[in-house]
Interface confidence: low
């Protein structure tokens, strides 16, 4: 009520300022009606204090400073030029899809998903990954044969309480090969793209850990394991990589259900991880090697090691028998790569980030949208991209590396007054000419606040305009670098420009 | 080892606000939640927010939602809680708590600070 | 917001007897699970967190000190009470936001 009486007298105080001014009244007049207006408004200011609007981004969600763009830029340019030199193919899908879409694809994760508020049209929900909406572009294309990528943004509504680390909107960098081709040889080269693009990042020592869905029903199987549980059992041994054995047990007994003994016995299998030998070792295993689907895991896993061998990557990947991935519509190979340290000073704890990507076969989920149930084989990879930033990102600060934001070649600066036309004649000469150039808006800029905005933004080069050097028809050239300063001709400063900064000729 | 050091006592009249800080050492920082817990005189534990430094969530108890602004400095490692509008049943014990984070389960609090008694009086 | 009953209020035991604290949950949802954890405060001292996720003893807690319990009712049990154990005890669950805690269990030598 005190507030609509407030706002009552600001807007008759209101009125009667602009009243006085329409008659014309004196200024002084006036300027005591404006100071009452104002206080008023202060005071209704204060009392809006109580109730303001705070200015923040969504929960889940983050700004981009241009440094960290800089950051992802480059992480983005080493995963699709990995990409690109496999052959793969990019295309894109719209950040929502029909609600049905997504429907039952993700088995406990489906209430993650954000449901867009129904317009009286289509009911929609944001992308959960980027692999439900690939099959279904698969299916409603009628491809049956494809290698592509597609980074893009998904959005998911983990509860900040229990995901440390996790956004709500998050990039995925994912890249799959869908057709029928024989067996292992691109799960192998997923595998070995993976390797690569984190060899590339440099961002520390990883291990890629590989398992099979059949071998993990199989394991449940002969374990004693419902069928009903085989989900949610999974879910728990997923867990294994976090806590110890006694506290994934527990979750088994204690929440989900099962019996002490059958617990045990998966106990038995899911603490080994080795090689190849570890998979000779369990197809000779009395129980697995009896169980139909276990067998077959176990061969596909024999056969991906042999290519692995030929990859040359063998020696990064441990066949682990905890690895189970979470999401409902793996098949077949899963695999999961995770940091084993972090660059760190010495005496500070190494970052736990966890996977830093994942992947695996999934030759139903197409069958899933085609009215026929046609099936098309699927093999893919994530790569976790937000984790990766961050982890860049701590390495930069931590070795205060300077990480340009632009990319500028040159800063065309004057060394006098009245020089703005010809630093404007000569900026768009070299934007002309293909050059990446900037200036200061400034008429008159102090030569010393330009070099110093020169050598904070890391440019290489500066081109310095003077009146001498016009007269002479030269530019003086000076490298940050090397802190050389040397006179150019005019017509050969785009070309010198060039050679320092080893640009071949291109135009806008 | 872990510590969690707060700001020292306050007195504070109705109406104002007040600030405590929790510096935290021992541990990575942003890997770990920073909960708020206030204790009023010879009564139980009443749990106030929390933030998560590592990506600047804070789960908030909706009854101070309005009142009480939790932030976090990563370049310090402290963790700040702002309570305004204040009365004299803000009169408690502040304590800052780390949240014990464990494969996504929810949280116990296995590191506390020594406490920061806020005395509100006219 | 979840409810959390501690009982009794205050209990008195002698040295080297059992004591048992309770807790239940008066949850939204049908159980809370095991997200139930014990905290031990000394006069003048912040809470110490003495048990997590029902029955999981933090490190260095002595095991005379066990939880157990699951879905709305909790229990906190010192197998032998030490002189050092005088203190008021509290649950907290962490199912949902809020947390919230018990209203506490003054522990006291008979």
């Known amino acids: 009520a005190d507030r609509a009486a407030l706002e009552e007298l600001v807007r008759l105080q209101g009125a009667h300022v602009r009243g006085l001014k329409e008659q014309k009244a004196s200024a002084e007049q006036i300027e005591e009606e404006v100071t009452k207006l104002l206080k008023l408004k202060a005071q209704l200011g204060q009392d809006e204090g109580k109730q303001k609007f705070v200015l923040k981004t969504p929960k889940g969600t983050r700004d981009y400073s241009p440094r960290q763009m800089a950051v992802r830029e480059k992480v983005f340019d080493v995963i699709i030029r990995c990409f690109k030199r496999h052959g793969a193919e990019v295309i894109d899908t719209p950040v929502f899809e029909l609600k049905e879409t997504l429907t039952g694809k993700y088995g406990e994760d489906s209430k993650l998903i954000y449901d867009l508020k129904d317009q009286g049209g289509e009911l929609l929900s944001l992308r959960y990954d980027l692999t439900v909406p690939f099959a279904r572009y698969l299916a409603m294309n009628k491809l049956t044969n494809i290698k592509r990528y597609h980074i893009a943004k998904v959005y998911r509504r983990d509860n900040p309480a229990m995901t440390r680390g996790r956004y709500r909107e998050f990039y995925q960098c994912d890249f799959d090969i869908a057709g029928q081709f024989d067996p292992m040889i691109p799960d192998a080269e997923c595998l070995k793209i993976m390797c690569e693009i984190l060899s590339s990042l440099q961002i520390g020592n990883f291990l890629v850990k590989v398992n099979d869905r059949r071998i993990l029903d199989g394991m449940f199987a002969v374990c004693g394991v419902p069928d009903s549980k085989f989900r949610t059992i999974c879910s728990s041994v997923d867990k294994l990589d976090k806590v110890s054995w006694e506290e994934v047990k527990n979750e088994m007994v204690g929440e989900k259900g099962l019996a002490p003994e059958v617990a045990d016995r998966i106990g038995d299998y899911v603490q080994q991880h080795g090689g190849v030998s570890l998979v000779e070792q369990l197809l000779q295993d009395p129980k697995l090697s009896q169980n139909k689907q276990a067998v077959e895991g176990l061969g596909d896993l024999k056969l991906l090691f042999e290519y692995l061998i030929l990859f040359g990557i063998d020696d990064k990947i441990s066949f682990d028998l905890s690895l189970a991935r979470g999401l409902d519509y793996y098949t077949g190979v899963i695999y999961e790569a995770v940091l084993l340290q972090m660059p760190t000073q010495a005496g500070e704890e190494p970052l736990g980030v966890g996977s830093i990507a994942a992947g695996g076969r999934y030759d139903g989920l197409v069958g899933m949208f085609d009215p026929k149930g046609r099936k098309v084989p699927c093999v893919g990879l994530s790569i976790g991209v937000e984790r990766i930033f961050s982890i860049v990102e701590q390495r930069l600060e931590a070795s205060e590396e300077k990480v340009r934001t632009t990319e500028t070649q040159v800063l065309v600066a004057s060394a006098q007054k009245k020089l703005l036309e010809e630093r404007l004649k000569l900026v768009s000469e070299l934007w002309d000419a293909g050059i990446k150039a900037e200036l200061l808006y400034k008429k008159n800029p102090k030569l010393l606040n330009q070099l110093q905005y020169w050598e904070e933004a890391g440019i290489p080069l500066v081109a310095i305009i003077g009146e001498q050097e016009l007269r002479d028809g030269v530019i003086k050239l000076r490298s940050v670098a090397s802190r050389e300063e040397v006179d150019v001709r005019r017509e050969d400063l785009v070309e010198e420009i060039r050679r320092r900064t080893n640009q071949p000729l291109s135009t806008c | 080892q872990v510590q969690l050091v707060q700001s020292g006592a306050e007195v504070k009249k109705p109406g104002a606000s007040v600030k405590v800080s929790c510096k935290a050492s021992?541990?990575?920082?942003?890997?770990?939640?920073i909960g708020w817990i206030r204790q009023a005189p010879g009564q139980g534990l009443e749990w106030m927010g929390d933030?998560?430094?590592?990506?600047?969530?804070?789960n908030d108890n909706e009854k101070f939602k309005d009142r009480a602004t939790m932030t976090a400095d990563t370049s310090t490692s402290t963790a700040y809680m702002e309570l305004s509008s204040l009365r004299s049943e803000d009169t408690a014990v502040y304590y800052c708590?780390?949240?014990?984070?464990?494969?996504?389960?929810?949280?116990?609090?296995?590191?506390w600070g020594q406490g920061t008694l806020v005395t509100v009086s006219s | 917001d979840i409810v959390m009953t501690q009982s009794p209020d205050s209990l008195a035991v002698s040295l080297g007897e059992r004591a048992t604290i309770n807790c239940q949950s008066q949850s939204v949802s049908t159980s809370t699970y095991n997200y139930m954890h014990w905290y031990q405060q000394k006069p003048g001292q912040p809470p110490k967190l003495l048990i997590k996720y029902a029955s999981n003893l933090e490190s260095g807690v002595p095991d005379r000190f066990s939880g157990s319990g699951s879905g709305t009712d909790f229990t906190l049990t010192i197998s032998s009470l030490q002189a050092e154990d005088v203190a008021t005890y509290y649950c907290q669950h962490s199912w949902e936001i809020p947390w919230t805690f018990g209203g506490g269990t003054k522990v006291e030598i008979k």
């Open positions: 021992g541990y990575t920082f942003t890997d770990y939640c």
């Open positions: 708590a780390r949240g014990e984070e464990q494969l996504g389960l929810r949280n116990a609090m296995d590191y």
């Open positions: 933030i998560c430094p590592g990506d600047t969530y804070t």
